[in-house]
Amino acid sequence: CEEPPTFEAMELIGKPKPYYEIGERVDYKCKKGYFYIPPLATHTICDRNHTWLPVSDDACYRETCPYIRDPLNGQAVPANGTYEFGYQMHFICNEGYYLIGEEILYCELKGSVAIWSGKPPICEKVLCTPPPKIKNGKHTFSEVEVFEYLDAVTYSCDPAPGPDPFSLIGESTIYCGDNSVWSRAAPECKVVKCRFPVVENGKQISGFGKKFYYKATVMFECDKGFYLDGSDTIVCDSNSTWDPPVPKCLKVLPPSSTKPPALSHSVSTSSTTKSPASSASGPRPTYKPPVSNYPGYPKPEEGILDSLD
């Protein structure tokens, strides 16, 4: 027989020879870091077929690291489900707790003994410091000094000294989250007031109000013979500007060769950026109709809008 087989877990006792005679036996021992558990054989014989009789290293078991219990409020999860050397132990904490120490320990061989690469971590309760104070506002539980996981606070704005109220910009409620960090930035309290939206040759049809504060929503329609350039719905944003900008109502010109068609009220097209106050001054561009299949409107090929007048 030629050289005997090699194994991961066991090694030949003595030096291997280039050739072995029929009937000759070789013995193995468990390698460093492995230990023998009977009764499986750890030897083989060169048989008359000039092959070695079957043998395996299943009798040699890896050294295992000491058992680690789950940390309080967490879990120790052995990778591959084993404590044997060469493998890892992963640690995770329950919701509301965070890890102090190493997230992964390695089962390592020191001499012939398997030991863990470090101390098991611990799981500490997630705690948050008080959330930020905000100008012109306050939050609930302002007297509490330590907040636990998922504890929530809600912000509100103070009464304003002037005629216009403070608006709360952002989410009013935040909670103590993972890593002892609040779930989002604190909101802000400020006066948000949009200007009165003026549309020439059109008018407001909903969202009427004395003043237009944060998130006020207004809708418009154009007079007969005019179409809406921009969005028919605008919202007062946190910068005290209308978003999208206040639209304009532009004149629809009838086809030059026919009498003017009957016109429906207004047609909304995609939003475009315009000045907040509709302006009748400045250059007057040529406009093409933005729509084609609305009742009473000329199709683009039937006539063009060459003026605002």
Epitope: K193, R195, F196, F208, K210, A277, S279
Partner: antibody
């Protein structure tokens, strides 16, 4: 307290251009929206137009082809120009501040009488 | 344009009277209506904006109401300084238009 003061010639000949200024004291013209309003003798009020802080203007269509409202920030003044005047344009002309971007007129000048006559 | 019609065009009343002036719009204007007071030889003064909101410094005897097309200005107890001409003004639609005025005279 912001004050508005209209000024200009009290007499304008027919077909000429009426030019008035509105001087702002106690504030900057760049932060005010200003309207011009007129009142013929013994009659009611008539809105002429407005100029907004962004420079945009809106005019009463009754005057559209002959009115211009502008601002001169260096002089802290607004101006009204009305061309091709007739006797029907004889009136007291007021400039009035649009309140905080909303179309109510909270602060008015004292008004200036313009007579159109040859 | 939206026409604003005031009634009556003139009215005689005594000090202490309760007075109501009406203003009618030719189409719905929501609450977009203001009231002004004008004394002879003077510029108008804003009394009420957005139908019922009192402008700063205006006495509480003045009040406004209405919605849509019909509006009223009420003076609960007339004072000597209240004798003047009153104008309504709409601002839902350009051009912003005024009523013809109501002249309030001493009886």
């Amino acid at each position: 307290q912001v004050q508005l003061q209209e000024s200009g010639p009290g007499l304008v000949k027919p077909s000429e251009t009426l030019s008035l200024t509105c001087t702002v004291s106690g504030g900057s013209v760049s932060s005010y929206d200003i309207s011009w309003i007129r009142q013929p003798p013994g009659k009611g009020l008539e809105w002429i137009g407005v100029i907004w802080t962004d420079g945009g203007t809106n005019y009463n269509s009754a005057f559209m082809s002959r009115v211009t409202i502008s601002v001169d920030t260096s002089k802290n003044q607004f101006s009204l120009k009305l061309s091709s005047v007739t006797a029907a344009d004889t009136a007291v002309y007021y400039c009035a501040r649009v309140y905080d971007g909303y179309p109510w007129f909270a602060y008015w000048g004292q008004g200036t009488l313009v007579t159109v006559s040859s | 344009d939206i026409q604003m019609t005031q009634s009556p065009s003139s009215l005689s009343a005594s000090v202490g009277d309760r007075v109501t002036i009406t203003c009618r719009a030719s189409q719905g204007i929501s609450n977009y209506l203001n009231w002004y007071q004008q004394k002879p030889g003077k510029a108008p003064k804003l009394l009420i904006y957005y139908t019922s909101s009192l402008h700063s410094g205006v006495p509480s005897r003045f009040s406004g109401s209405g919605s849509g097309t019909d509006f009223t200005l009420t003076i609960s107890s007339l004072q000597p300084e209240d004798f003047a001409t009153y104008y309504c003004q709409q601002y839902i639609k350009l051009p912003w238009t005024f009523g013809g005025g109501t002249k309030l005279e001493i009886k």
